[in-house]
């Protein structure tokens, strides 16, 4: 019996939680926070490798 497609998301990386519009989702700590606590991602220099910066996922109104 054929199984459905497997999730690309690891077991330790749950789907981003929906935040109320007053807040933003922090990918680093994986929960909703005041948007001012997030750091806007800065462009990386070519070839540089660093941990992913905090970013916000904002629900659409």
């Amino acid at each position: 019996m054929r199984r459905g497609p497997r999730s690309l998301r690891g077991r330790d990386a749950p789907a981003p939680t929906a935040c109320v519009p007053a807040e933003c989702f922090d990918l680093l700590v994986r929960h909703c926070v005041a948007c001012g606590l997030l750091r806007t991602p800065r462009p990386k220099p070519a070839g540089a490798s660093s941990p992913a910066p905090r970013t916000a996922l904002q629900p659409q109104e």
Epitope: T17, V20, A22, C32, A34, L38, Q58
Partner: antibody
Framework: EVKLVESGGGLVQPGGSLRLSCAIS????????MSWVRQPPGKALEWLGF??????????EYNPSVKGRFTISRDNSQSIFYLQMNTLRAEDSATYYC?????????WGQGTTVTVSA | DIVMSQSPSSLAVSVGEKVTMSCKSS????????????LAWYQQKPGQSPKLLIY???TRESGVPDRFTGSGSGTDFTLTISSVKAEDLAVYYC?????????FGGGTKLEIK
Amino acid sequence: EVKLVESGGGLVQPGGSLRLSCAISGFTVTAYYMSWVRQPPGKALEWLGFIRDKANGYTTEYNPSVKGRFTISRDNSQSIFYLQMNTLRAEDSATYYCAQVRRALDYWGQGTTVTVSA
Amino acid sequence: DIVMSQSPSSLAVSVGEKVTMSCKSSQSLLYSSNQNNYLAWYQQKPGQSPKLLIYWASTRESGVPDRFTGSGSGTDFTLTISSVKAEDLAVYYCQQYYTYPYTFGGGTKLEIK
């Protein structure tokens, strides 16, 4: 229609405790953040904190001015959310409002008055 | 904490006049990733609880008359009432929700001459 009704206010002695309630109707209680805000007589508003929704594990944020003395909780089965206030001081005398948080503090209750006095 | 300063603290106007009131924050409320300013305006009529008028600095809450307009960005914000009505007698508060703790301004009391 969203309706928030606070209760539990009254006169309490300094050092005492009080638990305020906010009864919620008109929306699914588990799907919204709920906040508490207070207003001393004739003064401006002060945000006390909020409790997030079910999807966010009912986590809380507090104003440092009350953190450790005040606790926000909720009883989703009864659509009520609470503000437990301990070690009350005269400066805690105010009208206390509950509010639904979405875009900002979207809907407010009518408030309940707390007086801390000997 | 972010300090919110409102001016004037009170003003008296005649019905039909245009009113502007100011709100300044001690740090920017603009989140550059989505270009939203995390600032709200509330109206509190005598003996009543506050009511949300404007969120994200300029978006009018559903049911709020279009004579109320929010503007500004960063640290300087304005609430304008294009033609005051007697029912607009109230205290108007701005509030930031850019970071914790959320903070309110001291309010602007609007009186009708």
